[in-house]
């Protein structure tokens, strides 16, 4: 289970209409459910139940986003529509280039994601918890554009690859 280095860049629009960027670094873990690959895209927050809709229709929104899912306590969802792995698969089917799970309230999900899968996803599935998860969710919950860049080695220059 390798460390995933995640850079999150928040884009704040300035009075002139340009963007000011703020970069936050945090760490998670690549799970065995997905590939240990770098990935980058706009963050899209997904509610766990939002991944339950099983219609196979693609919508008109763009591909290449990074899905962020805050998992709830198991007691709040005793009969989930999909396993955690199933939710990751559903997000990738809908165009996610990577999925990040906040497992702070559902640490059991770590074992589920790390059970050896015969058919692991070809995109990274990362989990974060604790202070890193709090930092991530604080950014995700803002009504602002944010991009995530996931790497499997520490970043050299934080903002080098980001442009809008």
């Amino acid at each position: 289970k390798e460390t995933a280095f995640v850079e999150v860049v928040l884009f704040e629009s300035s009075p002139s209409g340009d963007y000011t960027t703020y970069t936050t670094g945090l760490t998670g873990r690549f799970s065995r459910a997905g590939a240990t690959l770098s990935a980058e895209g706009e963050i899209v927050q997904m509610h766990p139940l939002g991944l339950c809709n099983n219609n196979d229709e693609e919508d008109l929104y763009e591909y290449g986003w990074v899905g962020v899912v805050k998992l709830e306590q198991p007691e709040l969802d005793p009969k989930p529509c999909l396993t955690v792995l199933g939710k990751a698969k559903r997000a990738v089917q809908r165009g996610a280039t990577a999925v990040i799970f906040d497992v702070s309230e559902n640490p059991e999900a770590i074992d589920q994601l790390n059970q050896g899968s015969e058919d692991p996803l070809k995109r990274p599935v990362v989990y974060v918890k604790g202070a890193d998860a709090i930092k991530l969710m604080n950014i995700v919950n803002k009504q602002k554009v944010a991009r995530a860049r996931i790497q499997h080695r520490p970043p050299r220059q934080p903002t080098e690859y980001f442009d809008m």
Epitope: Q45, H47, E58, L60, E62, Y63, G95, Q143
Partner: antibody, heavy 117, light 113 residues
């Protein structure tokens, strides 16, 4: 630089057909849903049709369902709108637009379709 | 289909004054997954294609000056131009892109008084 260039507009008789094209450049075309939006002279905007990034799913306004067909060729970075059984009320400037979670962020300059006998 | 209704149809405002446009949707455009309102505002000047101004009901698009602001949630939304400039004369449209078919409001023409 993102560019969308529509073509294929022109004069057609009622009941006739026309095929519009939209050539896209400056972005990864097969990562984005695309739409056609039209505007009749002096009127407002009307969303006509949309297609998902892969082309697997298509969507239509009720006013064109069964008459218009949206398609795309991701190898050619091109979006199409096949318009059959054209009516006088289809007369409009037709725009293609790139779809995102931020709405339609880039638009072409439009191509005029005139339906008249 | 979601019906979008704008008011007023036209608006005449003095230079430097505030212009306010309202938009109501027939059902909520709040996206259940990410809690964002899939509501955009566009500006269209004569002979030009529309230009994206605001998305997620309140976030300014790149290059849009801060005199333009959006607010609202669920079914009721507002576009405000805090200090009207000559270059803001245009027709403004709201659009829901929450569910297909996407739909626009009928437009509001903003002129200088």
């Amino acid at each position: 630089e993102v560019q969308l260039l529509e073509s294929g507009g022109g004069l057609v008789q009622p009941g006739g057909s026309l095929r519009l094209s939209c050539a896209a450049s400056g972005f990864t075309f097969n990562n984005f849903g695309m739409s056609w939006v039209r505007q009749a002279p002096g009127k407002g905007l009307e969303w006509v049709s949309g297609i998902s990034a892969s082309g697997r799913n298509t969507y239509y306004a009720d006013s064109v369902k069964g008459r218009f067909t949206i398609s795309r060729d991701n190898s050619k970075n091109t979006l199409y709108l096949q318009m059959n059984s054209l009516r006088a009320e289809d007369r409009a400037v037709y725009y293609c637009a790139r779809e995102t979670r931020h709405g339609s962020d880039y638009w072409g300059q439009g191509t005029l379709v005139t339906v008249s006998s | 289909d979601i019906v979008m209704t704008q008011s007023p149809d036209s608006l005449a405002v003095s230079l430097g004054e505030r212009a306010t446009i309202n938009c109501t949707s027939s059902q909520s455009v709040l996206h259940s997954s990410n809690k964002k309102n899939y509501l955009a505002w566009y500006q269209q000047k004569p002979g030009q294609p529309p230009k994206l101004l605001i998305y997620w009901a309140s976030t300014r698009a790149s290059g849009v000056p801060d005199r333009f602001s959006g607010s609202g949630s669920g079914t009721d939304f507002t576009l405000t131009i805090s200090s009207l400039q000559a270059e803001d004369v245009a027709v403004y449209y709201c659009q829901q892109y929450h569910s297909t078919p996407y739909t626009f409001g009928q437009g509001t023409k903003v002129e200088i008084k």
